[in-house]
């Protein structure tokens, strides 16, 4: 889900072209371009699997691909947490793990991935068209949420491929500050470049000064916040609603997958770092114009049962309010 790019070195404009403006137009665009290109964006993936042995049993795996430290993970069903979804489990990396029926076992698989086993009978049983969402709160990135469900035709025992979740939800609380600066900077940079369109512009050449310039990732936080303002909520229509079961569920028990590599907690070093994991690792670019997502060199991804987009337009205080009337 990442692209790599060399950050071009901006050559100084020829003397006398800009006069007093020369230094400003030299330094500012370079700084802003560096900020725009190097701004990293975390990603969340979700995998939902129905067990062959028990058709009412589901396993959800979620992971966070980012460099920040995870402060809380929330797993919900029926939609995103705070948008009609019901919390199934809350996992804190140090304080503990809590889960509620029909969740049977929530656990950390690595420092940046979790799994949750659900089971039930009758009304409390999950069904194939249920949407499951994982929300990762991290510092400094903020909160990121991805949702997934089993494809309608999936056979028991098989899993939906992990949703790569280009950027599925960004709570503005975590990113608005940095995003605002970057967004303004990028817009200003574009404005400067546009102004130079009909003038002799500085030549862009590959950098010779550093062996490798910073990596560029497909979505800067500024773009994420832009998307959050423009992409509407996707509505979930599920016929399977959770039911309450007053049951205690002890933790522990075997994991049904090999754990992801421990480097999942760190910023992955390009696509190769994830080659051994089930997460698709292909370069992509996410376009937020008209609220559409477009893969670089591909058709726009189908957001169908396995992928749901949930930007949060409610602003930084969206999580406040009595008892989850958030």
């Amino acid at each position: 889900m990442r692209t790599e790019a060399q950050v071009p070195a901006l050559q100084p404009p020829e003397p006398g072209l800009e006069g007093a403006m020369g230094h400003r137009t030299l330094v500012l665009p370079w700084v802003l371009l560096t900020l725009c290109v190097t701004a990293g964006t975390p990603e969340v993936w979700v995998q939902v699997r129905m067990e062959a042995t028990e058709l009412s049993s589901f396993t959800i795996r979620c992971g966070f691909l980012g460099s920040g430290s995870i402060s809380l993970v929330t797993v919900s069903w029926g939609g995103p947490n705070g948008a009609g979804g019901t919390t199934l489990a809350v996992l804190h990396p140090e304080r503990g793990i809590r889960q509620w029926a029909p969740a049977r076992q929530a656990r950390w698989e690595t420092q940046s991935s979790i799994s949750l086993i659900l089971e039930g009978s009758g009304a409390s049983s999950p069904c194939a068209n249920t949407t499951f969402c994982c929300k990762f709160a991290s510092f400094p990135e903020g909160s990121w949420e991805a949702c997934g469900s089993l494809p309608p035709s999936s056979d028991p025992g098989l899993s939906a491929p992990p949703t790569p979740a280009p950027i599925l939800r960004a709570d503005l609380a975590g990113i608005l500050g940095v995003s605002g600066v970057l967004l303004f900077g990028c817009v200003y940079l574009l404005h400067l470049l546009r102004r130079h369109k009909h003038r002799p512009a500085p030549r862009l050449q590959p950098s010779r000064t550093s062996p490798q310039a910073p990596r560029a990732r497909a979505w800067a936080p500024s773009q994420a916040s832009q998307a959050a303002l423009h992409v509407p909520y996707a509505t979930i229509n599920t016929s399977c609603r959770p039911a309450t079961l007053d049951t205690a569920h002890p933790h522990g028990g075997p994991s049904w997958w090999a754990s992801l590599p421990t480097h999942a907690a760190h910023r992955p070093q390009g696509p190769a770092a994830w080659a051994s994991t089930p997460i698709p690792a292909r370069g992509s670019f996410v376009s937020v114009e008209n609220g559409l997502y477009a893969q670089a060199g591909e058709r726009p991804p189908h957001t169908g049962p396995g992928l749901t987009l949930f930007p949060d337009p409610r602003g930084p205080r969206a999580m406040e309010g009595p008892l989850g009337v958030r």
Epitope: L72, T74, S76, N81, G82, G85, T86, T87, V90, H92, P93, E94, R95, G96, I97, R98, W100, A101, R107, W108, E109, T110, Q111, I114, P242, T244, L245, D246, A248, H249, P250, H251, G252, S255, S259, R317, M319, E320, P322, L323, G324, R326
Partner: antibody, heavy 114, light 113 residues
């Protein structure tokens, strides 16, 4: 910071039932998942259970199943614990606390006496 | 259920002294996935509710003085107060935060000479 305000002391007769409340005023998601803890006089703490405001689902310590019922009213931001068939063994201070026990109510003293 | 055993049951120390108290669990509180220990320490002063001091075996809750230090892993844990102050007079409880039911130890009563 979240505030948990519990209802006042209760004096009830054996065999009766009682309902204790805990009003949460917080600003983060986890502030509204409430634990209940019992502390008998001069004794340690016992976890009774927790309640999920999204589903009103609860987890219980097996020891308190049938004794305690945990519910929550999302609209008012209040969690409740009902205790039934009270005996002198139920006389204690009952606390509510947030999901990971980082904030506690002031406690409600329950006295069961004939 | 996980049984939490604290020792000693009481301590009598002078202000300025270093004090340690122990907590042992009947099962490991280490989460193998993220290598974190789910153990918490609480301080309860007379007539007050418990107050979270330490979580994750060693992480101080915000606002807790740095004279309080948690350590240990698996089944054996220690709370250390590097230089006891008069206001530290309290009961100290450890808690299994790993699995339900979330059991507490019997407590260590800290008394100041």
């Amino acid at each position: 910071e979240v505030q948990l305000q519990q209802s006042g002391p209760e004096v009830v007769k054996p065999g009766a039932s009682v309902r204790i409340s805990c009003k949460a005023s917080g600003n983060t998601f986890t502030d509204f998942f409430i634990n209940w803890v019992k502390q008998s006089h001069g004794k340690s703490l016992e976890w009774i259970g927790d309640v999920n405001p999204d589903s009103n689902g609860a987890n219980y310590n097996q020891k308190f199943k049938g004794k305690a019922t945990l519910t929550v009213d999302k609209s008012s931001g209040t969690a409740f614990m009902g205790l039934r068939s009270l005996t002198s063994e139920d006389s204690a201070v009952y606390y509510c606390a947030t999901l990971f026990f980082d904030n506690w109510g002031q406690g409600t003293t329950l006295t069961v006496s004939s | 259920d996980i049984v939490m055993t604290q020792s000693p049951s009481s301590l009598n120390v002078s202000a300025g002294e270093k004090v340690t108290m122990s907590c042992k669990s009947s099962q490991s509180l280490l989460n193998s996935g993220n290598q974190k220990n789910y153990l918490a320490w609480y301080q309860q002063k007379p007539g007050q509710p418990p107050k979270l001091l330490i979580y994750g075996a060693s992480t101080r809750e915000s606002g807790v003085p740095d004279r309080f230090t948690g350590s240990g892993s698996g089944t054996d844990f220690i709370l250390t107060i590097s230089s006891v102050q008069a206001e530290d007079l309290a009961l100290y409880y450890c808690q299994n935060a790993h699995s339900s039911p979330y059991t507490f130890g019997g407590g260590t009563k800290l008394e100041i000479k």
